[in-house]
């Protein structure tokens, strides 16, 4: 089997890491410096990865594998496999076209990526505003205010319906 | 058939250079990877690296880097390998090989084999 | 670098045993793609260089009897000698085969009672 599978197929016989040259008499071949073949078979290896400028290497390419990049400080990684980095903004600000940016009143942001977000509207689950938000934290919703007063129903009507969004005033 | 010849015996001094030899007949010699191994006395096998003959592309072991240079003479169908600053731990059988047909197929052709001995 | 470990170091039989030397890699030497392990065996006997015996963990190499016998597969591979005879005193070696540094196992020195 292995002999006939050679001969239908010479090609099928170099591993990951070589290409395949049917134009020598040894049809497989190592990868060149700086390039790879993951599948072996192949009639080129591809070329490595280089991460250069704000991408840094976080795994080194082989001759089976490429390169893996990742960002270097105050970026992170956007895009399937790291393909773009992005400028890090602190905690409370948003990146716009022009920069980082503030979040604006009624929205935070806990993270140094990623835009800001309204702040929760504790009362559209019936429940009043323990802690006050930030640009960097949320509001941390309590009790509603008739669960606070003595003798108080236990059952709490519901809140009037308002446009999500709004921040408790 | 592939043969391989390698060059003689060699008797050197501590901190010289030897440059063996592995002269090829009956195949073509710039179609096959040329590999080297290291063989001490009693001891296992080592792969010190290979060479492309068609263009001198080189493959080394990390742990020869420093210490192994290899080439070819297209015109004679010849390798060859220096070793520089030896030792005693250098003292060795050294083989040139080739694989055997495709290429990460076994290596089938051997030389008979240098014989280096580092001694003051 | 991949290393390759065999076992055991030695081993004394009478002409006719069953024989079998076991070599596994640090890492796997089964290429997906063609689903191929690249594990070759060889012997070498005293004052020779090595001969190779069986190539991709299982393809026995022209020439070499069929008392000999390779299997396995990723990281754990075998060389079976199915019944000893005396010409079969030597040295067997594994190699990963599959990338460079193209590394040997430690080697299993065979010695016939």
């Known amino acids: 089997f292995e002999r006939t599978r050679s001969l239908q197929d010479p090609c099928s016989n170099c591993p990951a890491g070589t290409f395949c040259d049917n134009n020598r008499n040894q049809i497989c071949s190592p990868c060149p410096p700086n390039s790879f073949s993951s599948a072996g078979g192949q009639r080129t290896c591809d070329i490595c990865r280089q991460c250069k400028g704000v991408f840094r290497t976080r795994k080194e390419c082989s001759s089976t594998s490429n390169a893996e990049c990742d960002c270097t400080p105050g970026f992170h990684c956007l895009g399937a496999g790291c393909s773009m980095c992005e400028q890090d903004c602190k905690q409370g600000q948003e990146l716009t076209k022009k920069g980082c940016k503030d979040c604006c009143f009624g929205t935070f942001n806990d993270q140094k990526r990623g835009i800001c977000r309204p702040w929760t509207n504790c009362s559209l689950d019936g429940k009043s505003v323990l802690v006050n938000g930030t640009k960097e934290r949320d509001v941390v919703c309590g009790p509603s205010p008739a669960d606070l007063s003595p003798g108080a129903s236990s059952v709490t009507p519901p809140a009037p319906a308002r446009e999500p969004g709004h921040s408790p005033q | 058939q592939a043969q391989l010849q390698q060059s003689g015996p060699e008797l050197v001094r501590p901190g010289t250079s030897v440059k063996m030899s592995c002269k090829t007949s009956g195949y073509s010699f710039t179609g096959y990877w040329m590999h080297w191994m290291k063989q001490r006395p009693g001891q296992g096998l080592e792969w010190i690296g290979m060479i492309d003959p068609s263009n001198s592309d080189t493959r080394l072991n990390q742990k020869f880097k420093d210490k192994a240079t290899l080439n070819v003479d297209k015109s004679s169908n010849t390798a060859y390998m220096d070793f520089s600053s030896l030792t005693s731990e250098d003292s060795a059988v050294y083989y040139c090989?080739?694989?055997?047909?495709?290429?990460?197929?076994?290596?089938?052709?051997w030389g008979q084999g240098t014989l280096v001995t580092v001694s003051a | 670098d991949i290393v390759m470990t065999q076992s055991p170091s030695s081993l004394t039989v009478t002409a006719g045993e069953k024989v079998t030397v076991s070599c596994k890699s640090s890492?796997?030497?089964?290429?997906?793609?063609?689903?191929?392990?690249?594990l070759t065996w060889y012997q070498q006997k005293p004052g020779q260089p090595p001969k190779l015996l069986i190539y991709w963990a299982s393809t026995r190499e022209s020439g070499v009897p069929d008392h000999f016998t390779g299997s396995g597969s990723g990281t754990d591979f075998t060389l079976t000698i199915s019944s000893v005879q005396a010409e079969d005193l030597a040295v067997y070696y594994c190699?990963?085969?599959?990338?460079?540094?193209?590394?040997f196992g430690g080697g299993t020195k065979l010695e016939i009672k």
């Open positions: 090989a080739r694989w055997r047909y495709y290429g990460y197929d076994g290596i089938a052709y």
């Open positions: 890492q796997s030497l089964l290429n997906s793609g063609n689903q191929r392990n690249y």
């Open positions: 190699q990963n085969d599959y990338t460079y540094p193209f590394t």
